[in-house]
């Protein structure tokens, strides 16, 4: 059973999570962006069902992609470099979802823009946070 | 049709700089990024690193990193490529490509024909 | 960065037989939200721009020969030339166009026997 400071320590990370995504869906929705046209024509892959902290599978597997978008806007809209931003989300996602978890993602049929796939995943992050507190 | 047309053969001392310019047309310089690839005579091809020209940002090979500038003149439908403190190994042809669309940056569908720079003393 | 690792160096086939060039990714090129691997081939003729042939690792590029295809997923791919024919005569080239940087392979020669 979760003791109440592995609890907490879970909700240190999700919450850390959020800031980073929010981070990143703040710098691209900045106005000065010039790049969130282009930005919106990338595909973006959301998982069926994130209800649980294995479902961050699914979001491990689209980061490399969101670092590929990142980049296009890499030094106007964010204080870390893409590679650094989404390494830092990396760790924490493999944190909170266990190295040793081979749940498969099953993926949804219909396409987000990124600023869709940042939200769901932003609202992931709430969400089960709000079952920790 | 998409069309890139690239500046004439350099020959060049080691220690100074070259710069390549490739032309876009049958569409809109500013839809799309370009890139920039390199091949050593009898060698592989190497990606040194692309620019947007709707705004100038830049992503540059680590390798290439200090060395290369790329520019673009949108009024011109043209992009640059400068490549600084040459030496005898940047000895290359050098290429600019656009991606086969703009939704995934890679890969390379249309290609210049391509520019001979010797380095030579 | 993704090594690729192309194989053979080069390959001597005659005519109208099968040619198979093979290409190693340090790093699986599968994307499992799409199911695509992005991976492509290149044809590359002396004093020619490399030529686009197949993206996604099995997607035929427009205008491109159909006795081209591609196959493969993950970390393992093919290019297959089902007939040769004189103007197949070329370099080919993998490229892995997932991650910055794209890198590509060293190539392989495709003579006639």
């Known amino acids: 059973a979760p003791t109440s400071s592995s609890t907490k320590k879970t909700q240190l990370q999700l919450e850390h999570l959020l800031l980073d995504l929010q981070m990143i869906l703040n710098g691209i929705n900045n106005y000065k962006n010039p790049k969130l046209t282009r930005m919106l024509t990338f595909k973006f892959y959301m998982p069926k069902k994130a209800t649980e902290l294995k479902h961050l599978q699914c979001l491990e597997e689209e980061l490399k992609p969101l670092e590929e978008v990142l980049n296009l806007a890499q030094s106007k809209n964010f204080h870390l470099r893409p590679r650094d931003l989404i390494s830092n989300i990396n760790v924490i996602v493999l944190e909170l979802k266990g190295s040793e978890t081979t749940f498969m993602c099953e993926y949804a049929d219909e396409t987000a823009t990124i600023v869709e796939f940042l939200n769901r995943w932003i609202t992931f992050c709430q969400s089960i946070i709000s079952t920790l507190t | 049709q998409v069309q890139l047309v690239q500046s004439g053969a350099e020959v060049k001392k080691p220690g100074s700089s070259v710069k390549v310019s490739c032309k876009a047309s049958?569409?809109?310089?500013?839809?799309?990024?370009i890139h920039w690839v390199r091949q050593a005579p009898g060698q592989g091809l190497e990606w040194m690193g692309w620019?947007?020209?709707?705004?100038?940002?830049?992503n540059y090979a680590q390798k290439f990193q200090g060395r290369v500038t790329l520019t673009a003149d949108t009024s011109t439908s043209t992009a640059y490529m400068e490549l600084s403190s040459l030496r005898s190994e940047d000895t290359a042809v050098y290429y600019c490509?656009?991606?086969?669309?703009?939704?995934?940056?890679?890969?390379?569908?249309?290609w210049g024909q391509g520019t001979l720079v010797t380095v030579s003393s | 960065d993704i090594v690729m690792t192309q194989s053979p160096d080069s390959l001597a086939v005659s005519l109208g037989e099968r040619a198979t060039i093979n290409c190693k990714s340090s790093?699986?090129?599968?994307?499992?939200?799409?199911?695509?691997?992005?991976l492509a081939w290149y044809q590359q003729k002396p004093g020619q721009p490399p030529k686009l042939l197949i993206y996604?690792?099995?997607t035929g590029q427009s205008g491109v020969p159909d006795r081209f295809s591609g196959s493969g997923s993950g970390t393992d791919f093919t290019l297959t030339i089902s007939s040769l024919q004189a103007e197949d005569v070329a370099v080919y080239y993998c490229?892995?166009?997932?991650?910055?940087?794209?890198?590509f392979g060293a190539g392989t020669k495709v003579e006639i026997k």
């Open positions: 490229l892995q166009s997932y991650i910055t940087p794209p890198t």
């Open positions: 490509a656009r991606s086969l669309d703009s939704t995934w940056i890679y890969p390379f569908a249309y």
């Open positions: 996604d690792a099995s």
């Open positions: 049958g569409y809109s310089i500013t839809d799309d990024l």
């Open positions: 620019i947007d020209p709707e705004d100038g940002e830049t």
């Open positions: 790093q699986s090129l599968l994307r499992r939200g799409n199911q695509k691997n992005h």
